[in-house]
Interface confidence: low
Amino acid sequence: DTHKSEVAHRFKDLGEEHFKGLVLVAFSQYLQQCPFEEHVKLVNEVTEFAKTCVADESAENCDKSLHTLFGDKLCTVATLRETYGEMADCCAKQEPERNECFLQHKDDNPNLPPLVRPEVDVMCTAFHDNEATFLKKYLYEVARRHPYFYAPELLFFAARYKAAFAECCQAADKAACLLPKLDELRDEGKASSAKQRLKCASLQKFGDRAFKAWAVARLSQKFPKAEFAEVSKLVTDLTKVHTECCHGDLLECADDRADLAKYMCENQDSISSKLKECCDKPLLEKSHCLAEVENDEMPADLPSLAADYVESKDVCKNYAEAKDVFLGMFLYEYARRHPDYSVMLLLRLAKAYEATLEKCCAAADPHECYAKVFDEFQPLVEEPQNLVKQNCELFEQLGEYKFQNALLVRYTKKVPQVSTPTLVEVSRNLGKVGAKCCKLPEAKRMPCAEDYLSVVLNRLCVLHEKTPVSEKVTKCCTESLVNRRPCFSALELDEAYVPKAFNAETFTFHADMCTLSEKEKQVKKQTALVELVKHKPKATKEQLKGVMDNFAAFVEKCCKADDKEACFAEEGPKFVAASQAALA
């Protein structure tokens, strides 16, 4: 349905509050270095313009596309060239090239200071003094640090942020009430950002066929009672929503997401018995709830898949008639029967099935050729099962911190060219899989673990794409989305790597170590561990453990000393010398 004025249409659909929030998010995700006040000014100008278009859709410029309107507004920023360099060249282009240009300049690792949390009383005062500005600041700070954050979901986070302050700033013990809520929002927010980044990478790097395959598998697991046609409709709609959000079309994305939630709630009977409690909630909460809804129970009487996909003489005929539909149906049928499999495994199985049909349907006796196709799945299923089993055993044996260290060593040996901060960040997150998934029952472990690992490894791929340093990483990241994790798992010690020269400065520590939080201390120690492995890639576990134990003892000793700095100055060089000797 076409509208005379797109901006008026979206303003009316979304309402002023959501409209302004989404425009602020869009601008903050594009111009990540601009000051808050500059963005607020631009958003207010766009909002005032939208209101004139609501009043009269024929008014001047109201017929322009949102990309044109928003792009023109962004290009009015005076300091564009100084702040963003070549990104300013985007403004010389016409739509749609201009928007594509802005998208290409989104920075996944912007050079922004870490967010420091002020004292609770300071935050509560700011919240009470100007609630609207306080919440806008939250949207701005999150959006500029996470340029692919799922915008309608960010509005939901902002609503929860507001609710936390409204409740806790009136509590007797404000800090005890507020800080756990803020920690939870921070952790959930980082996870949400990373999950969305994988969706955008899937769409942008591998195309909508890859995303649709992912969505078929995931929705079929969630909604095993829904018919294939119903799942296909949801997949088509969901693909549109995420394509829009990943493309910076945040108003359309939020509007279409609301429409999808409405459709799902109106058609619960043909989708899932689990939607009811979501559908009673207000819009933002409802959409979030639907996205996170648990898997419905599997129908009791599902027949064997072999009849239609192996034993039938019509397999090649069906495949030839509509390859993607037939493969989509296969994926749907397999996924609804296997909530215990990761989505990535299901996609590997579909890929293996497709490869077999491609080969066998050209053979002299196709049926004989593909008769054993399901046997082919066995090793594909066993591999992630073994991986989860081995790593959960290791996690239970070591605990999270030491498990992270084991992964740090493992991944530094695989790809030592990758920057130390990236290796630390990625390995710490890989290590969190233990606490997140290993406590789950067997049937939930693999989907939890492997799909989480896919999200974390996508972060590695995204950071590496910005500054490529390793052919191995490029290969694993670009060749196949579904085989990324197995590709990284398969990497061994990089024999071609020339060890990094020893730099004593890297292993020089000061008394400020003692005032760091436990997490910051861990990061310091893990940074040193990565540097050690880069210096001695062939060091044994025992050697590294010895050095790290000595390091912990040295830091503990100096942090207990009366003159901490003097202790670090004296003991530090001894630690370095002893470490070099231990690793020689």
């Epitope: 293996a352 077999t356 054993k372 046997d375 082919e376 090793p379 591999e383 061994e492």
Partner: nanobody, 125 residues
Framework: QLQVVESGGGLVQAGGSLRLSCTTS????????MGWFRQAPGKEREFVAA?????????DYANSVKGRFTISRDNAKNTVYLQMNSLKPEDTAVYVC?????????????????WGQGTQVTVSS
């Protein structure tokens, strides 16, 4: 159960070449990492070469054979090959092919679940 059968062994002079084949049946082949191991009389079994599952685009070799041996796979024929050039007397052994579903690529014998009987390679000086 996956059956693994090797062929192509024989007697060859030092400096010569041989091509070993390993064909699987019983279960399809594409999802297995494949490896070659060897065992000389009175010695431990040792890793020779491995190739990853699917397209086989990742390979691994023992240092002693690097640059002389090449492992490859043909998924359409359910076969993995070991091309051995510049053979030396110390390459004399029974060469055994194995399949692993433990990991996409492995050099560890304990991660291989299905083994062939082996084929004898003798290099004379």
């Amino acid at each position: 159960q996956l059956q693994v059968v090797e062929s192509g062994g024989g007697l060859v002079q030092a400096g010569g070449s041989l091509r070993l084949s390993c064909t699987t049946s019983g279960r399809a082949f594409i999802g297995y990492a494949m490896g070659w191991f060897r065992q000389a009389p009175g010695k431990e079994r040792e890793f020779v070469a491995a190739i990853s599952w699917f397209a086989g685009d990742t390979t691994d070799y023992a240092n002693s054979v690097k640059g002389r041996f090449t492992i490859s796979r043909d998924n359409a024929k359910n076969t993995v090959y070991l091309q051995m050039n510049s053979l030396k007397p110390e390459d004399t052994a029974v060469y055994v092919c194995a399949a692993s579903s433990a990991r996409p690529l492995s050099s560890r014998s304990d991660e291989y679940h299905y083994w062939g009987q082996g084929t004898q390679v003798t290099v004379s000086s």
